[in-house]
């Protein structure tokens, strides 16, 4: 049983407006519109949001007023479909408007673009930012919600409100300081990094819902919640997992008002039932709504009960294993996942789900045999290779990260992944490698028992994005193979890929490796991307180049940039030394 109220309301829009309050209501409607129609300007969306809010207020005043009984999808969809020049700007998305609800809303959802062709969200310089923030904080935050939501159409809406609130607090504090720039930059960079991670994690949840349904998501939630709340009983974990599944399903389905409302309800429930959930919730529960829900979502693991019996007792040694499994498969497997997960906060959720899958497959096979206990008696020992594989991955990669640093580690991953899938576009490979490489900074500095869950669950989320981008234009059989399996098998599948032997190397094009003096003035991040683009292209030209050969070329390239960017006449340096560099590269890779 979930915790959510289910009374019917005469007017859904009035109900949500009352529950959420005007500020959150408007923010969520803006996010919804920005995620559906990603090319519209802030002003266009702000106008629609105001119209929807005014209408909601009339329904609050009189729930029987005209159209107040309409569903939110009908109201929002009618607004979106009334936008002028929809076909010119959005092409076939306009066909959604010929459909009836609920097909129309689901048509909009299917047209969300994970990689919209929008320019990167550039942060204005501090002084300008503070001026516009002081002039109109509401409009300023509206722009933030709009710009993030349209670039991340599956961003978890209530969490985006939280990040906007963080943004607001940072600006309020830093804009009062003498040195605004040095106050703002590190703080806003921190929020940006966290928000980007939040985005890929949520996208993975929606992918799970889209491809495998709430059954798969609920299994993920049971494992995750059991790790965090090892003292809660199975019934409590199941209730929380059911509610968390509902909240996420609503957000992934574009039902953002319901999602935010139900998330607040779930946070309230958790805070009212701390005794049966966890001893670590009080600090979170003392915070206001958005901070409270965010805090609960990443609360530290409760202390594990000291007297937990060995997992084998109920799931291997018990004589009734096959009987219990046959009677209620999902419940029995659920209790296995719960019991195993609460004992292993040091494992990734992906690993726990792989173990549960292995256990299920073993029971399916063994319970049909003449002597089941003899057959499934070794199942826990058979988990060992499944556990060792990600542990080795973490050790190898963290050692490499410690040796090379973040940029060098990204380059090592870029070479590896370009060899695995050389047909993938260079910008996608560079983006993926840069994101995968951040795992070092994010996870390798953590205590030993936190590394594995951090590394593997983060890598899985990044690889999900690789799969989504590849789905749009499939070019690599390697990638297709790994992306078409189950979500939990993706990371091991990608890790196991080797050099693609079917690939015909790209011919060497001098212009790919020709650079100009404008590179010298680029910010460090952009310089890195240019160099990594060249590295990926080198590997595409010579997929079997040795690490040593690539290092020679990249060192030479770095030296060339350094020399020419320090030269008095940069343009001449680039035009004379550039061709020499290209020749040396060709020779080094010959």
């Amino acid at each position: 049983r979930g915790v959510f109220r289910r009374e019917a309301h005469k007017s859904e829009i009035a109900h949500r407006y009352n529950d959420l309050g005007e500020q959150h209501f408007k923010g969520l409607v803006l996010i919804a519109f920005s995620q559906y129609l990603q090319k519209c300007s802030y002003d266009e969306h702000a106008k629609l949001v105001q119209e929807v809010t005014d209408f909601a207020k009339t329904c609050v005043a009189d729930e029987s007023a005209a159209n107040c009984d309409k569903s939110l999808h009908t109201l929002f969809g009618d607004k979106l479909c009334a936008i002028p020049n929809l076909r010119e700007n959005y092409g076939e998305l306009a066909d959604c408007c010929t459909k009836q609800e609920p097909e129309r809303n689901e048509c909009f959802l299917q047209h969300k673009d994970d990689n919209p062709s929008l320019p990167p969200f550039e942060r204005p310089e501090a002084e300008a930012m503070c001026t516009s923030f002081k002039e109109n904080p509401t409009t300023f935050m509206g722009h933030y919600l709009h710009e993030v939501a349209r670039r991340h159409p599956y961003f978890y809406a209530p969490e985006l409100l939280y990040y906007a609130e963080q943004y607001n607090e940072i600006l309020t504090q830093c804009c009062a300081e003498a040195d605004k720039e040095s106050c703002l930059t590190p703080k806003l960079d921190g929020v940006k990094e966290k928000a980007l991670v939040s985005s890929v994690r949520q996208r993975m949840k929606c992918s799970s819902m889209q491809k495998f349904g709430e059954r798969a998501f609920k299994a993920w939630a049971v494992a995750r919640l059991s790790q965090t709340f090892p003292n809660a009983d199975f019934a409590e974990i199941t209730k929380l997992a059911t509610d968390l599944t509902k909240v996420n399903k609503e957000c992934c389905h574009g039902d953002l008002l319901e999602c935010a409302d139900d998330r607040a309800e779930l946070a309230k429930y958790m805070c009212e039932n701390q005794a049966t959930i966890s001893s670590k919730l009080q600090t979170c529960c003392d915070k206001p709504l958005l901070k409270k829900a965010h805090c609960l979502s990443e609360v530290e693991h409760d202390t594990m009960p000291a007297d937990l019996p060995a997992i084998a007792a109920d799931f291997v040694e018990d004589q009734e294993v096959c009987k219990n499994y046959a009677e209620a498969k999902d419940v029995f497997l659920g209790t296995f996942l719960y019991e195993y997960s609460r004992r292993h906060p040091d494992y990734s959720v992906s690993l726990l789900l792989r173990l549960a899958k292995k256990y299920e497959a073993t029971l399916e096979k063994c319970c049909a045999e003449a002597n089941p206990p003899a057959c499934y008696g070794t199942v826990l020992a058979e988990f060992q290779p499944l556990v060792e594989e990600p542990k080795n991955l973490v050790k190898t990669n963290c050692d490499l990260y410690e040796k090379l640093g973040e940029y060098g580690f990204q380059n090592a991953i870029l070479v590896r992944y370009t060899q695995k899938a050389p047909q993938v576009s260079t910008p996608t490979l560079v983006e993926a490698a840069r994101n995968l490489g951040r795992v070092g900074t994010k996870c390798c500095t953590l205590p030993e028992d936190q590394r594995l869950p951090c590394v593997e669950d983060y890598l899985s989320a990044i690889l999900n994005r690789v799969c989504l981008l590849h789905e749009k234009t499939p070019v690599s059989e390697h990638v297709t193979k790994c992306c078409s399996g189950s979500l939990v098998e993706r990371r091991p599948c990608f890790s196991a890929l080797t050099v693609d032997e079917t690939y015909v190397p790209k011919e060497f094009k001098a212009e790919t490796f020709t650079f100009h003096s404008d590179i010298c003035t680029l910010p460090e991040k952009e310089k890195q991307i240019k160099k990594q683009t060249a590295l990926a292209e080198l590997v595409k030209h010579k997929p079997k180049a040795t690490a040593e050969q690539l290092k020679t070329v990249m060192d030479d390239f770095a030296q060339f940039l350094d020399t020419c960017c320090k030269a008095a006449d940069k343009d001449t340096c680039f035009s004379t030394e550039g061709p020499n560099l290209v020749t040396r590269c060709k020779d080094a890779l010959a």
């Epitope: 959802l109 819902m209 349904g213 709430e214």
Partner: nanobody
Framework: EVQLVESGGGLVQAGDSLRLSCAAS????????MGWFRQVPGKEREFVAA????????RYLDSVKGRFTISRDSTKNAVYLQMNSLKPEDTAVYYC??????????????????WGQGTQVTVSS
């Protein structure tokens, strides 16, 4: 495998009613949602209504709202579609479908794993 058997179709006059039934049977039956779709020759299969197994949440195509009612009997693994005030444009083959994992989209036929053979509904004017 899951088997779905529909019944209750037939020929009726505009304004009349019909009740379609669909019974699901088979090994390890996991139902998250059951729905009804319909198809007219030469056209795509169209979502009509669906009901979630746990909460009993329902969704209807706008043009059938207020006329059609979907309900379930979880003890019998059955779903029903009560169709009132039928119109000639409701004429189609009606298919029952099961989603066994609770996928995100209600109206996409790819969200459903198992399908019945279909039952013909004809509404004459």
């Amino acid at each position: 495998e899951v088997q779905l058997v529909e019944s209750g179709g037939g020929l009726v006059q505009a304004g009349d009613s019909l009740r379609l039934s669909c019974a699901a049977s088979g090994r390890s039956l996991g139902i998250y949602r059951m729905g009804w779709f319909r198809q007219v020759p030469g056209k795509e299969r169209e979502f009509v209504a669906a009901i979630s197994w746990s909460g009993g949440t329902t969704r209807y195509l706008d043009s059938v709202k207020g006329r059609f009612t979907i309900s379930r009997d979880s003890t019998k693994n059955a779903v029903y579609l009560q169709m009132n005030s039928l119109k000639p444009e409701d004429t189609a083959v009606y298919y029952c479908a099961v989603d066994s994992s609770g996928r995100l989209y209600w109206t996409l036929s790819t969200s459903y794993d198992y399908w019945g053979q279909g039952t013909q509904v004809t509404v004459s004017s």
